[in-house]
């Protein structure tokens, strides 16, 4: 096909008439279609909704959308035998039972299937014990608990709070402490914002509503049973006993409600400073166990769940490009929900369902798009990012070789104040050129662009006039593009304004109270800041799938790893005895970043000057950038995280959430002090250097000229 | 032979910011090869690496005191400075400046030392 063919009409007008397209009215009523009943993973109204899906980008016109499914490892709670905590006397009787259910939100009362709270992938057991309070469970929690105030979680079931960081870390920890049993709950400090009315009056999190979520720790291996390979018909699986990052001890959620019941009583130490303590009215004693009065009465969990392999349903879009159709950019995001996905996922998923309705009107009207464009409703999100990861394993040859760009479509909010972006540098200075050409939503700023409010709202800690933009970590479907497979991603949302908000994500997140009414009454009532998150999130695909030349600049990945290997050199520069000792330079590693930056600078010249016209030549420089984010990949993965192979960035090991930067040489320093062979820690720190040093410099190599 | 010399005041109170210069004497600060650092070793406590400049101005900051610390270089002096805001007790110590490899911490040249006490 010849290259006017996918641009009839001027490229401005295209965008225009594509930002246009999209309509706020149509997401509120998309996002009413998908909240009315649970939408679980593995379920029947799963499967019926991404029938629904199919049929209906079907009709927007999209080329062909079909079904991946995969049978994956899903845990769910047993129906006859409920899950609960109890406080039990000196005789076992029960004297205090946690809660079995949510109460259920006006106008859901009568609805079946709501899933009750659980901890997904908890193994059964009754375990029985003391209870020990270990603030948010982190690492540096145990630290304190451990080596300064010399308490042994040993035996014992530990309680910790919501927030800060990914609940399986939290799980890992307990269970790297020697704990039997873990409680999670929701603290009133993190998840009730001040002034603000709890559900349905307001957005904040009723005393008895509770955070569902699995508690893996997959490190990216996607279907426990099937790590590296597709979960399909033929697959071979592992014992439950070699199954990947399946916790060994129970794990349970309650609410603050049913967590003032077991705090009260708390006796032993108490807390180490004023971090430690939430907002309830107890004392936050850490223990070990109960109180003088309380002191033989013990805690005990009953978990029943059981982990079943399970069908689940990707529906995948397509939109063939006219001149590039080998060359893919993906817009995915998840169906799944743990209730009614009020906010995760169906905001994002309404987002995407009018992204391909506006996509699919330019189509009709004879317009297509220069690269191909792929849409994916992703399913088993909440259980794992299953969906997604089997997906990309099962095509992983097409996508690392066809790969231009991912942009992840989860909650198109999580609040209401300004935008927030993790991405790849190489999107940088496409967000930052995209937000300027769109209107903000904001009030006080009306006829500025979203990039002005953006900025003002949430400034770059380096760069003034700048807004910021954050490291991709993982807890979402963009990992195994990313992270694995080295392909360009990136996600937007709307957020709240963290420094008056300090509350973790928001209030209602995994709960039965994330309903259409909770955005339609409390975030978003004319939807206009999922109209800005349609605008950004399309704009951006309809960019890189577009413009002839990809719009990535590899100068900005020059900037940021100069700064990470600043950050790197100062922490190790922490130990600088042992530096000395161990011969420890990091000077391999800022050759390596000078020499990409200098490379990257004579390839944005050519870039600048070559002749567009040459298809082969356009081509040849297309592939450089697009393949420069594979070049950071790293066949062989990170120390014991074998689908963690970027090595610029990598979820942090100690919260999945987010983003570290040369994580490979981070771990390696993490802790040193305490490591018991010096050597042998420090001689991995340089490898690990090394690693890195190489990776930069083979990646600048790329961009070098070809001959 | 290379030499550098501290100078500062060696009593500062708390809460108020700490102020250190360092002559560095023959030789030039404008080599791309080497570092300059401010160190510090209180009573009981091993070496503290509190940061580093090159002679273009890049700085690079210990993690724990990076809120409160900066570090500028005057090449036409041939000196580099140290400004540590809001000291408390914690912060008494014996300061040195230092000359390191560039991307190591080969710290081949420092000065004597200087002793700063933080009381009221």
């Known amino acids: 096909k010849s290259s006017n063919e996918a641009t009839n009409i001027t490229p401005k007008h295209n965008m225009k008439a594509f930002l246009d397209e999209l309509k706020a009215e149509n997401i509120k009523k998309f996002l009413y279609n998908f909240t009315q009943i649970p939408h679980l993973a593995g379920t029947e109204q799963n499967f019926q909704l991404a029938k629904q899906i199919q049929s209906q980008w079907k009709e927007f016109g999209l080329d062909s959308v079909e079904l991946a499914h995969y049978d994956v490892l899903l845990s769910y709670p047993n129906k006859t035998h409920p899950n609960y905590i109890s406080i039990i006397n000196e005789d076992g009787n029960e004297i205090f039972n946690t809660s079995l259910f949510e109460p259920p939100p006006p106008g859901y009362e009568n609805v079946s299937d709501i899933v009750p709270p659980f901890s997904a992938f908890s193994p059964q057991g009754m375990p029985e014990g003391d209870l020990v309070y270990v603030n948010y469970a982190r690492t540096e929690d145990f630290f304190k608990l451990e080596r300064d105030m010399k308490i042994n979680c040993s035996g014992k079931i530990v309680i910790a709070r919501y927030g800060k960081v990914f609940r399986g870390n939290k799980v890992k920890n307990a269970q790297l402490a020697g704990a039997k049993g873990v409680i999670l709950y929701s603290d009133p400090a993190d998840y009730f914002a001040p002034g603000v009315k709890s559900y349905p009056d307001g957005w904040n999190l009723p005393g008895g509503g509770v955070q569902r979520g699995n508690i893996l720790n997959l490190n990216g291996a996607g279907d426990p049973l099937t790590p590296g390979y597709p979960a399909n018909e033929y697959a071979y699986r592992r014992g439950i006993a070699e199954a990947v990052g399946l916790p060994s001890i129970p794990v349970h959620p309650i609410g603050y409600y049913d967590a003032q019941k077991l705090l009260e009583k708390m006796g032993g130490s108490a807390p180490p400073d004023s971090s430690w303590r939430g907002s309830l009215k107890v004392p936050y004693n850490v223990g070990p166990g109960f109180t003088g009065n309380f002191s033989t009465q013990k805690v005990k969990m009953h978990i029943h769940s059981t982990n079943e392999v399970t069908r689940i349903y990707n529906v995948i879009g397509t939109l063939r490009g006219a001149v590039e159709p080998d060359r893919y950019v993906i817009l995915g995001g998840h169906r799944d929900s743990w209730v009614f996905g009020g906010i995760d996922p169906q905001s994002g998923a309404a987002v995407v369902h009018e992204i391909v309705r506006s996509f699919g009107t330019l189509k009709k009207e004879g317009w297509r798009p220069r690269r191909t464009i792929l849409f994916a409703s992703w399913d088993a999100e909440e259980f794992g990012l299953l969906g997604s990861t089997e997906w990309a394993e099962e095509n992983s040859r097409l996508l690392q070789e066809r790969g231009v760009a991912y942009i992840n479509a989860d909650s198109s909010i999580e609040g209401n104040y300004t935008l927030r972006v993790d991405c790849t540098p190489l999107m940088y200075s496409l967000v930052h050129n995209l937000t300027k050409e769109l209107k903000s939503p904001d009030e006080g700023f009306e006829g500025k662009s979203l990039y002005e409010s953006w900025t003002k709202k949430s400034p770059s800690p380096e760069f003034s006039g700048m807004p910021r933009i954050s490291k991709l970590g993982s807890g979402n479907d963009f990992e195994v593009f990313f992270q694995r497979l080295g392909i360009a991603s990136g996600r937007a949302r709307y957020t709240k304004n963290w420094e008056t908000n300090k509350f973790s994500g928001y209030p209602l997140y995994h709960s039965v109270y994330e309903t259409y009414e909770l955005v339609e009454k409390f975030y978003d009532p004319m939807f206009k800041y999922h109209l800005t998150v349609a605008q950004v999130r399309g704009g951006m695909v309809f960019e890189l799938a577009n413009s002839i030349v990809l719009p990535f600049d590899c100068r900005d990945y020059a900037v940021v790893l100069r700064k990470y290997a600043d950050k790197i050199y100062s922490i190790s520069m922490k130990h600088p005895q042992e530096m000395k000792t161990y011969s420890v330079s990091f000077d391999s590693l800022f050759s390596a970043v000078k020499n990409f930056t200098e490379i990257a600078s004579k390839f944005s010249e050519r870039l600048q000057d070559f002749d567009k016209s040459n298809p082969i030549v356009l081509r040849m420089m297309n592939d450089q950038l697009m393949f420069l984010e594979r070049a950071f990949i790293d066949p062989l993965g990170l120390p014991d995280r074998p689908f963690y192979r970027h090595v610029i960035y990598a979820p942090s090991s100690h919260n999945k959430y987010a983003g570290e930067s040369f994580p490979g040489i981070y771990d390696a320093l993490f802790d040193i002090e305490s490591k018991v062979d010096p050597s042998k820690a420090w001689g991995e720190v340089k490898r690990q250097i090394y690693v890195a040093a190489f990776t930069v410099q083979a990646a600048a190599e790329t961009l070098s000229e070809v001959a | 032979q290379l030499q550098l010399q501290e100078s500062g005041p060696g009593l500062v109170k708390p809460s108020e910011t700490l102020s250190l210069t360092c002559t560095v004497s023959g030789g030039s600060i404008s080599s791309s090869n080497y570092f300059w650092g401010w160190i510090r070793q209180s009573p009981g406590k091993g070496l503290e690496w509190i940061?580093?400049?090159?002679?273009?101005?890049?700085?690079y900051y210990n993690p724990s005191l990076k809120s409160r610390v900066t570090i500028s270089v005057d090449t036409s002096k041939n000196q580099f400075s140290l400004k540590l805001s809001s000291v408390t007790a914690a912060d008494t110590a014996v300061y040195n400046c230092?000359?390191?490899?560039?991307?190591?911490?080969?710290?081949?040249?420092r000065g004597q030392g200087t002793l700063v006490t933080v009381s009221s």
């Open positions: 230092a000359r390191h490899k560039a991307a190591t911490a080969d710290f081949d040249y």
């Open positions: 940061g580093s400049i090159d002679y273009s101005g890049y700085t």
